[in-house]
Interface confidence: low
Amino acid sequence: EEDGFCQPYRGIACARFIGNRTVYMESLHMQGEIENQITAAFTMIGTSSHLSDKCSQFAIPSLCHYAFPYCDETSSVPKPRDLCRDECEILENVLCQTEYIFARSNPMILMRLKLPNCEDLPQPESPEAANCIRIGIPMAD
């Protein structure tokens, strides 16, 4: 088993955002395992009345890119690309504020879904953030 490697995305749940691009995985079994988790989470989300349209438009692709991060093609070793911190913060604090509060207090959701913690992401001006995955969230003025 490798320490982490890049492989084409083979799933369905996030195919419309990722296609068959290369994603970073930590073990051979990880992609299938995460696919099962995110499929279950999206099923829960789909039946929930707690998700607004303005949130889901960007939250779903963001969760997909967090679960299946693109490989950093600029790196000589397999490495995941981070989400962009500025977009993460707008998603959490503006577009999906109510939904995040609900999700973080709901063990059933947390069991199935890994929510990115924006504090863990590189600062926007840092070198590590130069190649972050941008979802296309409109920036607040």
Epitope: E26, H29, E33, N36, Q37, K114, N117
Partner: nanobody
Framework: EVQLVESGGGLVQPGGSLRLSCAAS????????IGWYRQAPGKQRELVAR???????YYADSVKGRFTISIDNSKNTLYLQMNSLRAEDTAVYYC?????WGQGTLVTVSS
């Protein structure tokens, strides 16, 4: 940003036991996998054990049956229980979550 801090290393005799801890400054339950690596002097860093968010564990062949990885999400802490230690287990042990690393804790197995 999240900080990972390892502890529990030290000097132990062959056949002895140690329990390493990795405390995180934020929740580690959101990571899809978190694990332990080690680097012996003059050697490359290698994966020792990993646990996924669904509880699946992976162990390097050299530690199977001797080491046990576990996680306590309520304490934001990852553990590595190391039994029947051997001289070849001597290394700096690192906690890892995706591309985040701790500073390492030294384990020395010697009589």
């Amino acid at each position: 940003e999240v900080q990972l801090v390892e502890s529990g290393g030290g000097l132990v005799q062959p056949g002895g036991s140690l329990r390493l801890s990795c405390a995180a400054s934020h929740s580690i339950s959101r990571f899809y996998a978190i694990g332990w690596y080690r680097q012996a002097p003059g050697k490359q860093r290698e994966l020792v054990a990993r646990i996924s968010s669904m509880g699946r564990t992976y162990y390097a062949d050299s530690v199977k049956g001797r080491f046990t990885i576990s996680i306590d999400n309520s304490k934001n802490t990852l553990y590595l229980q190391m039994n029947s230690l051997r001289a070849e287990d001597t290394a700096v042990y690192y906690c890892n979550a995706r591309n985040l690393w701790g500073q390492g804790t030294l384990v020395t197995v010697s009589s």
